[in-house]
Interface confidence: low
């Protein structure tokens, strides 16, 4: 067959076994309906096709699989399990496919999966065992190196009365399966806080993107064990100040670059330690652009240009003198 083929006719759908494994023998040259395949590039693209399930007849040579812009809704256990297995699949992009439910073991039987992108899906349900594949206290290590979870927050009314942050963190922690993860992107998820142990099971992280969330504080988060961390993106959050414990932990990471732009820094007496740290550190990229948002009298002042005399806290007025 030609290196690039596009199947226009629907191939017969494979019968599914109880374990959701396709038993249909696959011809190396075949390509699923509504997909474009390049055997030379080891790539299959089923993009913007309104698919409601993962094609069963994926060619065994696939290394890069794009299933973006579809209507998958649910990703069941063994969604990519095949006979023979998709042993070479290394990069899987499912972004913007209206996924609402990723079930336990959805990515099982993908021994080479290095990159997974689930961005721009309204994940109302993300199983704690979505990435680990089992509910064992210690799971087999996942081969994942990059996990992209930007803008996966569902609409408010579809959150099942659960903490979205907690749901995501549970999936990241389960069984220690993601010990080898190097990149984690969690941008644009309306996170209000980071659970205390969010990073405990991710010791190999090099790049962590938490930008464009609603984080107000990092007080309970520990970065201490992330000794390989190279970039930490905290731009466009609601951070008011970084306290001594956080500053010390960031300073102790030998390779890190921290991005803090576009946070509403409150330049009062609580900011003194952070300003002193900013003047000394080289870990903050763009530190000369950081400015105060509050109080009003300090708005747009450059943090690095402040001294201790600028950073005062107004005495608290007794209730009788307070105005609404």
């Amino acid at each position: 067959s030609s290196p690039t083929s596009s199947a226009s006719s629907s191939s017969s759908s494979a019968p599914f076994l109880a374990s959701a494994v396709s038993a249909q023998p696959l011809l190396p040259g075949q390509c699923p309906a509504l997909c474009e395949c390049s055997e030379a590039a080891r790539t299959v693209k089923c993009v913007n096709r309104n698919l409601t399930e993962v094609p069963t007849d994926l060619p065994p040579y696939v290394r890069n699989l794009f299933l973006t812009g579809n209507q998958l809704a649910v990703l069941p256990a063994g969604a990519f399990a095949r006979v023979p297995p998709l042993a070479e699949l290394a990069a899987l992009n499912l972004s913007g496919s209206r996924l609402e439910d990723v079930q336990a073991g959805a990515f099982e039987h993908l021994p080479s999966l290095r990159q997974l992108d689930l961005s721009h899906n309204p994940l109302a349900v993300l199983s704690p065992f979505a990435f680990s594949g089992s509910n064992a206290s210690v799971s087999a290590p996942s081969p994942l190196v990059e996990l992209i979870l930007n803008h996966i927050v569902p609409p408010e009314d579809e959150r099942n009365n659960r903490s979205f942050e907690g749901m995501v963190v549970a999936a990241l922690r389960a069984g220690g399966a993601l010990h080898g993860l190097h990149r984690l992107e969690l941008a644009s998820n309306h996170f209000l806080y980071l659970p205390r142990d969010v990073l405990a099971q991710l010791p190999s992280l090099r790049h962590l993107d938490l930008s464009n969330n609603s984080l107000v504080s990092l007080t309970y988060v520990s970065f201490r064990n992330l000794t390989h961390l190279e970039s930490l993106h905290l731009e466009d959050n609601a951070l008011k100040v970084l306290h001594n414990g956080t500053l010390a932990e960031l300073q102790g990471l030998p390779h890190v670059r921290v991005f803090l732009d576009n946070n509403p820094w409150v330049c009062d007496c609580h900011m003194a330690d952070m300003v002193a740290w900013l003047k000394e550190t080289e870990v903050v990229q763009g530190k000369y652009q950081l400015t105060c948002a509050f109080p009003e009298k300090m708005r747009n002042r450059v943090l690095l240009e402040l001294n201790s005399a600028d950073l005062d806290c107004d005495p608290i007025l007794p209730p009788s003198l307070q105005t609404s």
């Epitope: 390779h255 670059r257 732009d261 080289e282 870990v283 990229q285």
Partner: antibody, heavy 117, light 108 residues
Framework: QVQLQQSRPELVKPGASVKMSCKAS????????ISWVKQRTGQGLEWIGE????????YYNEKFKGRATLTADKSSSTAYMQLSSLTSEDSAVYFC??????????WGQGTTLTVSS | QIVLTQSPAIMSASLGERVTLTCTAS???????LHWYQQKPGSSPKLWIY???NLASGVPARFSGSGSGTSYSLTISSMEAEDAATYYC?????????FGAGTKLELK
């Protein structure tokens, strides 16, 4: 593996401008800072500035501000440096280097600039 | 700006000799951000020691680095022919980033 491939040698006249390139491969271009470093023949190393392609943050050595312009094209994973109002003092080898506060791990092979009438 | 002064400017050493190159900063530098590079004629510099004392990938164990504050050093426990090169110290503690003028190490 990581590679930084720099553009060919340049021979330009005094007062002119030059734009040299540094094409990155083998890593995610938007994740790492690229610095530019000048080395005159038989001399030491001088930092010109750095660019972070991920957010287009740029820092210059005050000495080169106004004459050096650093840019990056994410689509081609290429960093550029333009130098204007050239004089013979600008004749040197210019290196791009990848890394940051933990050292410049990878360097380009250098672009030789000769400014002569 | 932080000025890094390297001494000596040129040094000759015999095979097997212990060699120490020094780098003095005009003001204190965080030891995480003090690095050394090796450069041979016609080649690009190579990261040799990072964060004062960590050997870069592929650097022989006979090299070591130490120091803090304003005083740093690179030591070769036993000089070999391939070590002949120019060594630069470099600080990433304050902008502008600066390099020392280099120490040229020659084989005697």
């Amino acid at each position: 593996q990581v590679q930084l491939q720099q553009s060919r040698p340049e021979l330009v006249k005094p007062g002119a401008s030059v734009k040299m390139s540094c094409k990155a491969s083998g890593y995610t271009f938007t994740d790492y800072v690229i610095s530019w470093v000048k080395q005159r023949t038989g001399q030491g190393l001088e930092w010109i500035g750095e660019i972070y392609p991920g957010s287009n943050s740029i820092y210059y050595n005050e000495k080169f501000k106004g004459r050096a312009t650093l840019t990056a094209d994410k689509s081609s994973s290429t960093a550029y440096m333009q130098l204007s109002s050239l004089t013979s003092e600008d004749s040197a080898v210019y290196f791009c280097a990848m890394g940051g506060n933990y050292g410049f791990d990878y360097w380009g092979q250098g672009t030789t600039l000769t400014v002569s009438s | 700006q932080i000025v890094l002064t390297q001494s000596p400017a040129i040094m000759s050493a015999s095979l097997g000799e212990r060699v120490t190159l020094t780098c003095t900063a005009s003001s204190s530098v965080n030891s995480n951000y003090l690095h050394w590079y090796q450069q041979k004629p016609g080649s690009s510099p190579k990261l040799w020691i990072y964060s004062t004392s960590n050997l870069a990938s592929g650097v022989p164990a006979r090299f070591s680095g130490s120091g803090s504050g304003t005083s740093y050093s690179l030591t070769i426990s036993s000089m070999e022919a391939e070590d002949a090169a120019t060594y630069y110290c470099h600080q990433y503690h304050r902008s502008p980033l600066t390099f020392g003028a280099g120490t040229k190490l020659e084989l005697k």
